[in-house]
């Protein structure tokens, strides 16, 4: 039987000669467990593993800790790839994180973090970021230093409230902080003055809910 090639991320897929956008099967580091991920082979040279996408409100992002751990949605559409996979892969080598944003007026912007990784589940998948560049604000809309991940059934934020219940969605909430890309999806003309929407404060401010978001990772040495 022909031996199957194992890919740890979309950068490995790209380097193997598969350079078309689409869904590929990736394998967890040091494991045989597999996950389906969308690979962006065009943006900034390709090789990006998409870990989150919002585009139309078709998927409910008010999910449990376990669902955010293993992932949900459809990799070709709205989805969350899964905190456990992202933790494992970003602890193998240095990764960059690119966050691409769209507003309802046809504008696009991005934030690029030159070093990104998650802590493990025992540390609540705490986010670690360094070196921000990009057009979506000079200040990071993910609070620094990074916070623990919170969901509707796991309150790890710094607010007396439960941010995930107040603002909806799982995120690295502060108290509750300047971003939540997993908030409620609001259609055009209903997207302003929505404090529980898809927020990236240092680009669009407090009450603006975005049209689209993509979070993607790639090895720093790609």
């Amino acid at each position: 039987k022909e031996e199957q090639i194992i890919y740890r991320d979309c950068a490995e897929v790209f380097k193997s000669g598969l350079t078309t956008n689409g869904i590929y099967t990736l394998t967890f580091p040091n494991s045989t467990e597999e996950i389906k991920a969308y690979c962006d082979m065009e943006t900034s040279g390709g090789g990006w593993t998409v870990i989150q996408r919002r585009e139309d409100g078709s998927v409910d992002f008010q999910r449990t800790w376990k669902e955010y751990k293993v992932g949900f949605g459809n990799p070709s559409g709205e989805h969350w790839l899964g905190n456990e996979f992202v933790f494992q892969v970003t602890n193998q080598q240095p990764y960059v994180l690119k966050i691409h944003l769209k507003d309802w007026e046809g504008n696009e912007a991005y934030s690029l973090y030159e070093h990104f990784y998650l802590s493990g589940e025992e540390l609540n998948y705490r986010i670690h970021l360094k070196g921000l560049t990009g057009t979506a604000g000079k200040i990071s809309s993910i609070s620094q230093p990074g916070n623990d991940f919170s969901t509707k059934d796991a309150d790890n934020d710094k607010c007396i409230c439960k941010c995930s219940q107040m603002l909806t969605g799982g995120w690295w909430f502060d108290a509750c902080g300047p971003s939540n890309l997993n908030g409620m999806y609001y259609p055009q003309r209903q997207n302003t003055n929505k404090f529980n929407g898809i927020k990236w404060y240092y680009w669009k401010g407090s009450g603006y809910s975005l049209k689209g978001t993509t979070m993607m990772i790639r090895p720093a040495d790609f």
């Epitope: 409230c161 509750c176 300047p178 404090f195 407090s206």
Partner: antibody, heavy 121, light 107 residues
Framework: QVQLVQSGAEVKKPGASVKVSCKAS????????MVWVRQAPGQGLEWMGY????????GYNQKFEGRVTMTTDTSTSTAYMELRSLRSDDTAVYYC??????????????WGQGTLVTVSS | DIQMTQSPSSVSASVGDRVTITCKAS??????VAWYQQKPGKAPKLLIY???TRDTGVPSRFSGSGSGTDFTLTISSLQPEDFATYYC?????????FGGGTKVEIK
């Protein structure tokens, strides 16, 4: 200490406009959203809208949309609320208040002393 | 808009009395409720936020409770300076709204 000082009382004719100011001191002006709340004589409190001094972003209560404009001057740490096409039922005390958070419009921890606007022909 | 229905609209009480004011939201507001005290001719003053957290400097005789749609402000032992009007405020949903107020008067 943290305080908000508002401009003095105004008497206006119906159809006119009024611009109320609110000067902040004792904290970093751009770190907190500012809201405007009004109170008609003997009545309750009514939220008019907010402004984020950091980026100028605003959100208005639909009831006042098109008639109200909120602005700030960060060089003087002053917020302004202009209400146009005044009617007699706009007679009220207008308050500015600071929200406890930059990123959300939640509860209001510091209030100005209020500005009485009387609309009368 | 979410309606905040406060009751009673007024209450007569004596110094030392326990006073309870309730506020009912027309839909679930989680714990996103604040309480303010207002004296005649003065601006409102924040007492409680997140339904039960006292603001800095607020005496311990003031307490708040509740979640969802039903909220309570309690003054455990009324003091002379507590005679005022009290307002609840929801900030869970846009636009923020206030209750109609409860006037606490001297009996």
């Amino acid at each position: 200490q943290v305080q908000l000082v508002q401009s003095g009382a105004e008497v206006k004719k119906p159809g006119a406009s009024v611009k109320v100011s609110c000067k902040a001191s004792g904290y970093s002006f751009t770190d907190y959203n500012m809201v405007w709340v009004r109170q008609a004589p003997g009545q309750g409190l009514e939220w008019m809208g907010y402004i984020d001094p950091y980026n100028g972003g605003t959100g208005y209560n639909q009831k006042f949309e098109g008639r109200v404009t909120m602005t700030t001057d960060t060089s003087t740490s002053t917020a302004y609320m202009e209400l146009r096409s005044l009617r007699s039922d706009d007679t009220a005390v207008y308050y500015c208040a600071r929200t406890r958070d930059r990123y959300d419009v939640w509860y209001f921890d510091v209030w100005g002393q209020g500005t009485l606007v009387t609309v009368s022909s | 808009d979410i309606q905040m229905t406060q009751s009673p609209s007024s209450v007569s009480a004596s110094v030392g009395d326990r006073v309870t004011i309730t506020c009912k939201a027309s839909q679930d507001v989680y714990i996103a409720v604040a309480w303010y005290q207002q004296k005649p001719g003065k601006a409102p003053k924040l007492l409680i936020y997140w339904a039960s957290t006292r603001d800095t400097g607020v005496p311990s005789r003031f307490s708040g409770s509740g979640s969802g749609t039903d909220f309570t402000l309690t003054i455990s032992s009324l003091q002379p300076e507590d005679f005022a009007t009290y307002y609840c405020h929801q900030y869970s949903s846009y636009p923020p709204t206030f209750g109609g107020g409860t006037k606490v008067e001297i009996k």
